[in-house]
């Protein structure tokens, strides 16, 4: 999808022109003199994330589709794979290997010309924002965090289902009904709609030409590509529509005016393109059909949207018309259609995000409202953790309850627990385990959000099948949570894979702020008063040497956490004593790259293990680097 990932892989190339048409590419090559081997790269208009290579030879332009493989490599059909479009072009400058000739001279974009963004690119940001806002009813920081953390998944979701929001897509209606709808209202040649034919991903394009409605079948092949019979193949319906709004290419005529669903007002903005002979006024706008869309409305998750009505042309070809598919297309019904996203879970937003749930002024909770299960989930420094249920004003919330050891009535420990509670109650971020409150009953209890799958290190030890893409996604989420802590002037001090809990295989939360202390805004570190039990292998040198803890020392710990994650939960510095680890670090040595870990991720670990705290990046930089790599890999 010409997403940030795709654009990054080619935008920097001076001979990459973006989303230009085949004809435009040919015009550029003519401008460049059409010498043999003159070439340029453009974005594929029918394959998500793909490219097209346009090469001059024998005074003619030859075009090759470059597809993006599932593993993120690039290849011309039947050719060898390459890590990037640039690598592919470099290879073909030395080997023709199926091309009409060697690539000899790139035709670079003229001065001031930027790669052209596709029509969907302009729409995508808005579509994603609206989709997230309305599907999960998010706003503010929760909305921003959702978009950042799930952008690749959301882009894919939007790209492959965007047609369901388009005014020309009428869902599953009969051939007869589609004809009648097309014939309601203006009779512009090229007026069209697309309807779903069956549940196997087959569609029909209904096109008005000289008062008659023509039906073209759109089939999906085994790889999911869409095409009219004998026609060009596309990844998405909106790409197909965009293509046929530029050229007929097998249809009787180009697509001009989308036949809107009855009762869907103001979805299309026409105007801007020169009037075409014989076309309806207000037909065209710069950039084809897609770029005319200017508003969207998304159904709420799990809600059926009732359908609107349509029109009849038997005795009248009037102008009346409302419609919408029977089941709201993007009503993320949380059914089997897709893997659950973090936003689908109950712990993405604070339980107090619901205005009807009043956040108690006190950190203390009523013990009578808390029910505990017998089974222990685990045990930690403070005691055991059990699953429980807390009766809130509106809902019963599944919670994890830390039960303090009875002998821990030691005032110092009690203070530590209260400190943890006060710290945690101030924190509210999707990638942090939120604290609901504390109970003083048979024991002290800390009531927190539930993360069913448990610690990251244990999960990865038991689930070696988890792909590195998935691990990148999870560590990116941890970096987002830590960036939030850094912005909130909180130092974690015990960041490790054991303190990252999984809600789902694709959703991580940072837990255990047992050693956290709120920084005063004007301080960037504080000195630990006593040694205690220190997790030295996760500590930055300045913590060990000078007891100085800061968000920068959390960055060091994050590097170790990354190493644990890519090692599938192995213990860091295996078999070494704390003193040996310290000596190793002083010598400038670091842990090796885990088997199968991407080089970029190991480079980032090493950056986190920068000895000098001043030169070590903060979480803002770490998160951005992870984000960019994550987008690139997932796309």
């Amino acid at each position: 999808m010409a997403s940030s990932g795709m654009a990054d892989s080619a935008n920097h190339l001076p001979f990459f022109f973006g989303n230009i048409t085949r004809e435009e590419a040919e015009d550029y090559l003519v401008q460049g003199g059409m010498s043999d081997g003159l070439y340029l790269l453009r974005q594929s208009r029918n394959y998500l994330g793909g490219f097209a290579l346009s090469v001059a030879h024998g005074r003619k332009a030859h075009h090759y589709t470059i597809e993006r493989e599932l593993n993120g490599t690039y290849a011309i059909a039947g050719g060898r794979t390459h890590a990037s479009p640039a690598d592919l072009c470099h290879y073909h400058s030395q080997e023709s290997d199926g091309l009409v000739c060697l690539l000899k001279k790139p035709f670079n974009r003229p001065q001031g010309v930027q790669p052209k963004t596709g029509p969907f690119e302009d729409l995508k940001e808005n579509l994603i924002r609206e989709y997230v806002k309305q599907t999960w009813n998010l706003q503010g920081q929760a909305l921003e965090q959702a978009i950042i953390s799930q952008k690749p998944q959301l882009e894919k979701l939007i790209a492959t289902t965007a047609h369901e929001k388009m005014p020309w897509f009428h869902g599953k209606i009969s051939r007869e009904e589609s004809e009648q709808i097309v014939l309601i209202g203006s009779k512009t040649n090229g007026k069209f709609l697309i309807r779903a034919r069956d549940n196997n991903g087959s569609y029909a394009l209904c096109l008005l030409h000289e008062g008659k409605v023509l039906h073209y079948r759109i089939d999906k092949d085994k790889t999911g590509k869409l095409s009219i019979p004998e026609g060009k193949k596309f990844d998405t319906l909106w790409q197909l529509v965009e293509h046929y709004s530029y050229k007929a290419d097998g249809l009787l005529r180009v697509l001009t005016v989308p036949c809107q669903k009855i009762g869907t007002q103001g979805n299309v903005n026409f105007g801007g393109r020169p009037q075409l002979p014989g076309s309806h006024p207000a037909t065209w706008s710069a950039g084809g059909i897609i770029s005319r869309i200017k508003s969207y409305s998304f159904p709420k998750p799990g809600h059926r949207k009732s359908s609107p009505a349509q029109g009849n042309r038997q005795e009248s070809t009037v102008s009346f018309n409302p419609y919408e598919p029977e089941l709201a297309p993007w009503a993320a019904d949380k059914g089997p259609q897709r893997e659950a996203l973090p936003m689908d879970t109950e712990v993405y937003e604070s339980p107090y995000a619901d205005p009807e749930e009043i956040r108690p002024k006190e950190v203390y909770l009523d013990r009578k409202l808390l029910t505990l299960e017998d089974k222990e989930l685990g045990s930690g420094n403070f005691g055991t953790v059990k699953k429980g249920y807390y009766q809130m004003k509106k809902v019963v919330k599944t919670v994890a309850v830390k039960i303090l050891k009875n002998e821990a009535n030691d005032p110092a420990l009690k203070d530590e627990l209260l400190a943890e509670a006060n710290v945690m109650q101030q924190l509210d971020n999707p990638y942090i385990v939120r604290m609901i409150g504390i109970c003083e009953a048979e024991s002290w209890m800390l009531v927190m959000e539930m993360a069913e799958l448990g610690p990251l290190n244990k999960y990865l030890q038991q689930n070696r099948h988890v792909k590195d893409k998935n691990i990148i996604e999870l560590v990116h989420q941890v970096s987002m949570g830590m960036k939030y802590l850094e912005e909130s002037n909180f130092v974690h001090r015990d960041l490790a894979a054991r303190n990252v809990l999984l809600v789902t295989q694709h959703y991580a939360k940072i837990s255990d702020f047992g050693l956290s202390k709120a920084l005063r805004a004007d301080e960037n570190y504080y000195k630990a008063q006593t040694h205690g039990k220190w997790p030295v292998k996760w500590y930055a040198p300045e913590c060990i040497n000078y007891y100085k803890f800061s968000s920068k020392s959390d960055v060091w710990s994050f590097g170790v956490l990354m190493w644990e994650a890519f090692s599938y939960g192995q213990k860091p510095y295996r078999g070494m004593k704390g003193s040996e680890v310290t000596a190793m670090l002083e010598k400038g040595e670091r842990m090796g790259c885990p088997a199968g870990c991407p080089r970029e991720m190991y480079d980032l670990m090493n950056l986190c293990w920068t000895y000098d705290v001043e030169n070590r990046p903060g979480f803002a930089a770490v998160e951005l680097r992870l984000r960019n790599y994550y987008y690139d890999v997932v796309n």
């Epitope: 005014p167 209606i173 009969s174 007869e176 009904e177 009648q180 309601i184 209202g185 203006s186 512009t188 005016v257 809107q260 669903k261 009855i262 009762g263 869907t264 007002q265 103001g266 299309v268 309806h280 006024p281 207000a282 009732s306 359908s307 609107p308 009505a309 349509q310 029109g311 009849n312 042309r313 038997q314 005795e315 009248s316 070809t317 009037v318 102008s319 009346f320 018309n321 409302p322 419609y323 029977e326």
Partner: antibody, heavy 115, light 110 residues
């Protein structure tokens, strides 16, 4: 000759659901593709509420969409309108009609929303 | 506020010819058919003109419709007292994707 006849309660309480039925005679409901509802508040103009296609697809006025449901019962040769959460502003004469262009109309039924 | 604009009232004497106008925009009247309905006092509307100028059977030829650009008009010649009624124009609106009506014109036969 097609005839349409609206029926339903003439008085509905605020916040309740208004329910009307349009019985079609002299014509099979499956023979004409579009059936519609229109309303006219006292002393005011006409407002389109929605259509139902004989197959059951429904199309509504966006301003009423969240509250309207139109359904068809082919066995009884009738179609119905439900309008939820009514207020005094929904007081009107409600008409059912045939065809997109409203070629034939029922005689209308006055529905008053009042407690 | 109606999408199509009609004068609120019109009048004429028996035998006279009166015209009722209806103005819209390119997305409705400009690109689609116009319909006219007659509503006699205390009765339901009745289709008078469809597809700009077509009369359903039973409608006298004294009633005629025309359209030009984004406006349409209904002409009634040989005005009779039984023509006293409200008259509504309607058209399909492509941008609203729905039928739209005029506010209605009350015709008084003096």
């Amino acid at each position: 000759q097609v005839q349409l006849q609206e029926s339903g309660p003439g008085l509905v309480k605020p916040s309740d659901t208004l329910s009307l039925t349009c019985a079609v005679s002299g014509y099979s409901i499956s023979s004409s593709n579009w059936w519609g509802w229109i309303r006219q508040p006292p002393g005011k103009g006409l407002e389109w509420i929605g259509y139902i296609y004989h197959s059951g697809s429904t199309y509504y006025n966006p301003s009423l969409k969240s509250r309207v449901t139109i359904s068809v019962d082919k066995s009884k040769n009738q179609f119905s309108l439900k309008l939820s959460s009514v207020t005094a502003a929904d007081t009107a004469v409600y008409y059912c009609a045939r065809n997109v262009g409203f070629h034939d109309w029922g005689q209308g039924t006055l529905v008053t929303v009042s407690s | 506020q109606s999408v199509l604009t009609q004068p609120p009232s019109a009048s004429g004497t028996p035998g006279q010819r009166v015209t009722i106008s209806c103005s819209g925009s390119s997305s409705n009247i400009g690109s689609n058919y116009v319909y006219w309905y007659q509503q006699l006092p205390g009765t339901a509307p009745k289709l008078l003109i469809y597809r700009n100028n077509q009369r359903p059977s039973g409608v006298p030829d004294r009633f005629s419709g025309s359209k030009s650009g984004t406006s349409a008009s209904l002409a009634i010649s040989g005005l009779r007292s039984e023509d006293e009624a409200d008259y509504y124009c309607a058209a399909w609106d492509d941008s609203l994707a729905s039928p739209v009506f005029g506010g209605g014109t009350k015709l008084t036969v003096l």
